[in-house]
């Protein structure tokens, strides 16, 4: 008969598995089976026989099963024996990859690849790869004192970089056992790399401030950089140093704060690999009451005005007020307190009010004092410009600039300007022995010229109190200069002429230079020398003139600076008439008498009088003086016809007389032939 085993000669079993060894016979109907180990160790298994088959089952397989198992089959008197070598190994699990911590960019990390419960571990090889790059390979050839299942590890330290994100770590374990066809000789583990950045640059922003008032609110916002994005945790440091967790939000808002909320608040940015904290100290102050004094810390008050100082309290429901001066002089003002306001009215403000006034507010046990300095000034009106007289070209004049009721005097400056030019400047720096309102003046003398006309004379007064707030600190008065020029170059234009015919019209126009423009006054000189006013117009017009209009006319240019005259003689000519031709003493005289022949034209001045003696041989023009011709010792030949012609531009008139000269001898009249 024959004996067969399954497996035939060798069985490679994994520790912990169930192993069945089968022994069967052919050619023997009822064989007897027995199993033993080659060194007669315990079987550590269970035998089941069924017909021509016997099975040895070992469950679970362990080191105690690593033997050569012999199956003996007895058929009647014949024995057959066959052995199966059971060899054991252990490689039950895939490797495990462990990191010494999260992968933090730039920080070395140790990767450990562990293969658990390996036997025999001197046949183990572990490779560690990052992507396609082999980082380390190791064989475990170290010696041991016995067969055992051990966990074998390979360690590599490397520094991750951001570029490693997404790469994989591969741990590959190989157990080099000959003829191990039926089991995997290679196992591997894969871990995807996630590179982290530990939280850093943790920043806290506090709004409105780290110093807060009781009852107020604060919002604190915290941010931290890292990968993955850090979670934000807020806590407060307790007195014992421990942290009291407050919030897991980036923003922490505290409302209706109390003093006990003061302290150090900690914001911590936390992610898988680290934490980074920032602290901020909040100070919650007891809600203070505040005192405001208005109009401000100092007030400039004009003497005589009314001033109201107001003391206002915030943050106190029922304050009590008191006012005093810094030197505890009398208040000399009216106090009125109502609710959270108190007013001190000084009216009218006088020198006794020039103090620092203190408002003391009491709220519960707390007192607050606020001061206001009342500074006085007086500068009520613009300067007054006065001149000693009118401005006359070339004549000196005294200008006075007066600033009334000034205080403080030692800060006053007066400046006199003509156009852009400073004429005079004075500062009143003298000390005064008492506070008083003073009138201050600047006086100066100057000689105006025509060119000054139109220029501005400015008196500027400045009160140099820069630290006082009042308006204006500068006052000025302006006067435009008009320099008077006495009339001159007075001229008269007569149209059509100063000599004219009776009945015609005449225009006499008077022109006079001066400033202000001279006033024109026409008059006529009367025979007695007096002047008869005629007109105040520049042009004097006479219509339908009569001879009696002839005469001396006077034009006068008058202004504040003086007067200037111009005379013009007007001659009104008429046709000569009323000619009288007389002989004196008679028209009949004796030879040897003196005879005056006189021709007068009474109505017309400026006529030509021509005396002629008529004769057949021709007229003889006699030399007359003012129309009179004197014949001394008349002779007979002087008898005859005498003719007078009164002649002017307008016309002429003739008169004639016959002179009779009687001879003394014959007493004959001699008449000149006609």
């Amino acid at each position: 008969f024959k004996i067969e085993t399954t497996p035939e000669s060798r069985y490679l079993a994994q520790i912990g598995d169930s192993v069945s060894l089968t022994c069967s016979t052919t050619g023997c109907e009822s064989p007897f089976f027995s199993w033993r180990t080659q060194i007669d160790s315990p079987l550590n298994g269970k035998v089941t026989n069924e017909g021509t088959t016997s099975t040895l089952t070992m469950n679970p397989v362990s080191f105690g099963n690593e033997h050569s198992y012999l199956c003996t089959a007895t058929c009647e008197s014949r024995k057959l024996e066959k052995g199966i070598q059971v060899e054991i190994y252990s490689f039950p699990k895939d490797p495990e990859i462990h990191l010494s911590g999260p992968l933090e960019a730039g920080k070395p990390i140790t990767v450990k690849c562990s293969v658990a419960d390996v036997y025999p571990f001197d046949r183990l090889e572990i490779d560690l790869l990052k992507g396609d790059h082999l980082m380390k390979s190791q064989e475990f050839l170290e010696d041991a004192d016995r067969k055992s299942l051990e966990t074998k590890s390979l360690e590599v330290t490397f520094t991750p970089v951001i570029e490693d994100i997404g790469k994989v770590l591969v741990c590959r374990a190989k157990l080099h056992i000959d003829e191990m066809d039926s089991v995997p000789t290679v196992r591997q583990a894969v871990k995807e790399l996630q590179v982290y950045i530990s939280p850093k640059n943790t920043v806290i922003s506090v709004n409105p401030s780290t110093k807060l008032q009781e009852g107020g609110s604060v919002t604190m916002t915290c941010s931290s950089e890292g990968l993955p994005a850090p979670e934000i945790f807020w806590s407060k440091k307790l007195d014992n140093g421990n942290l009291q967790h407050l919030s897991g939000n980036a923003t922490l808002t505290l409302i209706a704060m109390r003093m006990e909320d003061s302290g150090i608040y900690v914001c911590e940015g936390v992610n898988l690999i680290g934490k980074n904290r920032k602290e901020v100290e909040l100070i919650v102050q007891e809600k203070p009451f505040t005192v405001e004094i208005s109009p401000g810390p100092r007030i400039a008050a004009q003497i005589g005005d009314s001033v109201m100082l107001t003391c206002s309290v915030m943050g106190c429901e029922s304050p009590s007020f008191s006012w005093r001066t810094q030197i505890d002089s009398p208040l000399s003002g009216k106090v009125r307190s109502e609710g959270t306001n108190s007013t001190l009215t000084l009216s009218p403000v006088s020198f006794e009010n020039e103090h620092s006034y203190l408002c003391t507010v009491t709220c519960g046990h707390k007192k607050l004092e606020k001061g206001i300095q009342v500074e006085l000034y007086s500068f009520p009106r613009d300067p007054e410009i006065e001149m000693s007289g009118g401005l006359v070209n070339g004549s000196s004049v005294t200008v006075s600039c007066k600033v009334p009721s000034v205080y403080p005097l030692d800060r006053l400056e007066i400046e006199l300007l003509k156009g852009e030019t400073i004429l005079e400047n004075i500062e009143f720096l003298e000390d005064t022995d008492m506070k008083s309102l003073e009138n201050k003046s600047l006086e100066m003398t100057f000689i105006p010229t025509i060119e000054d006309t139109g220029k501005a004379l400015v008196c500027q007064a400045k009160l140099h109190i820069d630290d006082m707030e009042f308006e204006p600190k500068q006052r000025q008065s302006t006067q435009t200069l008009y320099v008077n020029v006495a009339p001159r170059d007075t001229t008269v234009l007569v149209s059509p002429s100063s000599i004219l015919e009776e009945g015609s019209s005449v225009n006499m126009t008077c022109l006079s230079q001066g400033f202000p423009a001279p006033k024109i006054l026409w008059s006529r000189q009367l025979p007695n020398g007096e002047l008869q006013p005629l007109s105040e117009n520049a042009t004097l017009t006479l219509i339908s003139t009569k001879m009696e209009d002839s005469g001396v006319y006077l034009c006068e240019g008058i202004n504040q600076a003086g007067r200037s005259r111009k005379e013009v003689e007007l001659i009104i000519q008429v046709t000569p008439k009323d000619i009288k031709l007389t002989a004196f003493p008679s028209e009949s005289v004796k030879e040897g008498d003196t005879v005056i022949i006189s021709c007068t034209c009474g109505n017309v001045p400026e006529t030509w009088i021509i005396l002629k003696k008529k004769a057949e041989t021709g007229d003889t023009v006699l030399k007359s003086i003012d129309g009179a011709y004197t014949i001394r010792k008349a002779q007979l030949k002087d008898a005859g016809v005498y003719e007078c012609e009164s002649k002017n531009k307008v016309g002429s008139q003739l008169r004639s007389l016959t002179l009779d000269v009687q001879g003394r001898e014959n007493n004959k009249d001699y008449f000149s032939p006609e």
Epitope: S90, A116, D117, K147, S148, E150
Partner: antibody, heavy 113, light 112 residues
Amino acid sequence: EVQLVESGGGLVKPGGSLKLSCAASGFTFSSYTMSWVRQSPEKRLEWVAEISSGGSYTHYAATVTGRFTISRDNVKNTLYLEMSSLRSEDTAMYYCARGELYWGQGTLVTVSA
Amino acid sequence: DVVLTQIPSTLSVTFGQPASISCKASQSLLDRGGKTFFNWLLQRPGQSPKRLIYLVSKLDSGVPDRFTGSGSGTDFTLKISRVEAEDLGVYYCWQGTHFPWTFGGGTRLEIK
């Protein structure tokens, strides 16, 4: 420095139970097979039980199989031996060992009526 | 189970003299992988056992080179070239090839 410290020994009546502990430090506990070995009052050494590094596999001496249980906690780095149905022949100094290279100082178990 | 027999059970020596301890196994301790898991331990008075030699002849770190291990199959020997005071105690052999692991009965080394 490798250190193994046993505890839990004491006097127990036959049939009673005890649980021994061994606290390990100074090495990667989870990588090694750990054993319990006992030394009788007559100073004979006997291997009792062992547990694989991962804790999946246990082996026992025939004399204790079914009565003793070996276990480990790789987080706490502690090895245990739970003993029940104790007999007088179990009286011994029980040592915790890594391989047989490192041994603890031992804990004495006395089983006596 | 594999039985390990140690000879002698007590060994009296003089300081500075050599000493030799023998250990015989009931079957070969050669493993199929070619290794012999045979070891020597020393238990000094009042102390825990301590491994001296593993895999027949390999000295553990810190063990003086006056100790030598030898042998194969079933016969193994531990030799001390010059005995010193710190060598006194009980020497045990033990095997880790065949399950269950077993120990020898021990040899006490003492001073004459």
